[in-house]
Each structure stands twice: as structure tokens, then as C-alpha cells.
Interface confidence: low
């Protein structure tokens, strides 16, 4: 069985059930896709497209589904057991150090560098120095000479919100 969803994972209004509520059908926990009833006796299903729970839990409320931001595409919808999977639109990517927004991929590499990696929803284009082969990505000085690139094909989600 999966680990319990912890208090920190919950929005303020989604408080975990107090200990005395742990008397639902399966060792005090409800299965994924459900939350515990207020009297702790029953498991209540989450509402498709509105909320979800991914683990065995004693939540009084299911977790609210993420809505994809503008600039993101919905890779898979929210179900009762899985949150929405959002992905950056073609030509944009999400960096690990700034996961809150999708950033535009560069259109080409600076002078003296060649492109070795396409723009993907989770990475900018990759450039290496022609001579040394040293990789370079992230912020660069103003591009003086560009090599046109086409966005890569999305292969996996760059964000699994929730």
C-alpha cells in the first residue's frame, strides 16, 4: 500500500481526519479515489474531474484537481485516482528551478556553438561549443547568430502538479 498523504500535502481546508475517525472499512483508511466520511464509518468516492486521492488515506476531503495554466496543455485529465498532468506547450519548457511557469525555448545557439538537443517540454535546446564539446544551456548572451530549430516532440510530462 502507498504511503499516507501527509498533512503538508493538503490545502488548508483539506485537513486530515483526527485519529478517532480511523474506523473505515480497511484498517481505518480509504482506497485511492475516495476519502473518509465525517463519522469515519464509510469511504466516499471523489468527484471525477473535480477532486482525487492517489493513496490509501484518511482525508476528510479529496484533493482538488489541478487546472492547467495558459501556456500548458492537458496531457491527461484528472481522474478520481490521479491528478491532472499538465505539460508546457510546444516551444516552451519548465525548468526545475522555476517550475511555476513555462519559459520560451531559445530559437538557436550563440555564435561558436552548435545545437545538440531539441526544445522539449522539460528542457531548453542544448548547445555545445564547436571546439570543446562543452554543453551550454539556460540564459545566454544576446544571440548574434542563430541556428533555427524545431520544437521536440513531447514524450513525457514536465509537471505532475498536486
Amino acid at each position: 500500500e502507498s504511503a499516507l498523504i501527509t498533512q503538508q500535502d493538503l490545502a488548508p481546508q483539506q485537513r486530515a481526519a483526527p485519529q478517532q475517525k480511523r474506523s473505515s472499512p480497511s484498517e481505518g483508511l480509504c482506497p485511492p479515489g475516495h476519502h473518509i466520511s465525517e463519522d469515519g464509518r464509510d469511504c466516499i468516492s471523489c468527484k471525477y474531474g473535480q477532486d482525487y486521492s492517489t493513496h490509501w488515506n484518511d482525508l476528510l476531503f479529496c484533493l482538488r484537481c489541478t487546472r492547467c495554466d495558459s501556456g500548458e496543455v492537458e496531457l491527461s485529465p484528472c481522474t478520481t485516482t490521479r491528478n491532472t498532468v499538465c505539460q508546457c506547450e510546444e516551444g516552451t519548457f519548465r525548468e526545475e528551478d522555476s517550475p511555476e511557469m513555462c519559459r520560451k525555448c531559445r530559437t538557436g545557439c550563440p555564435r561558436g556553438m552548435v545545437k545538440v538537443g531539441d526544445c522539449t517540454p522539460w528542457s531548453d535546446i542544448e548547445c555545445v561549443h564547436k571546439e570543446s564539446g562543452t554543453k551550454h544551456s539556460g540564459e545566454v548572451p544576446a544571440v548574434e547568430e542563430t541556428v533555427t530549430s524545431s520544437p521536440g516532440t513531447p514524450a513525457s510530462p514536465c509537471s505532475l502538479s498536486g
Epitope: P25, I44, Y48, Q50
Partner: antibody
Amino acid sequence: EVQLQQSGPELVKPGASVKISCKASGYTFTDYYYLNWVKQSHGKSLEWIGYIYPNNGDTSYNQKFKGKTTLTVDKSSSTAYMEFRSLTSEDSAVYYCTRGSNWIWYFDVWGTGTTVTVSS
Amino acid sequence: DVLMTQTPLSLPVSLGDQASISCRSSQSIVHSNGDTYLDWYLQKPGQSPKLLIYKVSNRFSGVPDRFSGSGSGTDFTLKISRVVAEDLGVYYCFRGSHIPPTFGAGTKLELK
């Protein structure tokens, strides 16, 4: 047309196990539906046994049947299975698989039913 | 578990009659989202059950409008305005959204 085709009748001895199948067709098996199993003893009402969520294999069981049954799926053949262990005469019944929409808890499609008879 | 009590267990009718079946839950079955997951199924002799009504009053596709569901909280009713031969069988109420989902004992609709 959405259909749930179940395996044929079973005659088994007390203490034995039985595994019955339910083949789904007419819809995407791994879409957002639960595959439930329901027991109907002769001339009696219906009892929910449990469900399996084909998309990720999640299961939930009625406490009464926990440890007695195991629900599995084979995604490649769009088939759900229910295995019953340590059978007694109390397990003689018709077993239905049913499709349940996971955002509205109704069973919109029912299987053909599998009769299990436990007798020595 | 929540107990679903159906009355009557047997309902003799003449064709063309109105029929009414009651289902009472041992506790409120209103979901925390405000919906009430109370469904009705009909099982004809030798057949699998079929869904008639979901969420108290919504007719499932293909179900004739002579079937109607009503109720709230703990008390629910299925009405058939004019019984025809194909309506004969056993009617079950069903409480969804809580684990374990529970069926009523059934009401047998039969000819007088």
C-alpha cells in the same frame, strides 16, 4: 456496443479455488471506469464484492470478501478476473462483473453472469 | 455498513396500474459534494440487472419516461406510471459513493 462477456459455469469442490473471467469490449478498457464484481446468491439480493481500476490496478474490497477473493486484470486482452479461494457452499451463486463510471457510482453495463456451484 | 430497506418485498399489480416502491437508508447518503448517489436497477427473470435511474431521479439512456425516481436524505421512491408486461421483475435500490456500495433486498413486481 459495450459488452462484458463472462466465462461459463463452474462446478467446484469445497475447499477448491475458482477463477472466473470478464472480457470487456466496445470501449477502452483502461478509460475511467471501475470493473466491479457483484454476487447474487440463489433467490437473494445483490452484494458488491469489490472493484478493480484497470487503468492502474487499484482494488477495493468489501470487508466481507477480503482475503477470500483476488481481483486482477490483463490489460492486453481487456479482461478482468476474480479468483475465489477456499470455496464453501455459501459461495454458490451467480457472479456478475459490472462497469462502474468512477465519477458517478452507477453500474451502467452488466456482464452475462457466471454460475458457480460448490458441491462435493 | 449502511442498510437499504425496500418496501414492499412483493408488489402484485395489474397491467396499466401505477406502482410505487420505497427505499429507506439507515443514514443519510448525501455525498459531501451535495449529490445523492441512489440508483434503481431492474432484474428480469433469467437476466442480468439493468440500470434504470441514477442519482435519485435521472433516467438512464433508453429507459421509458413511465419510470421516475424521487426522494432525498434517507427516503427514496421509484414510481412506474403505467405498468406494462416488460416491467415485471425484481427492482433493487442501490446506494453508491460509499464503500461498500449496498443494494436493497429487492421488490418483486408481479401480476395479481
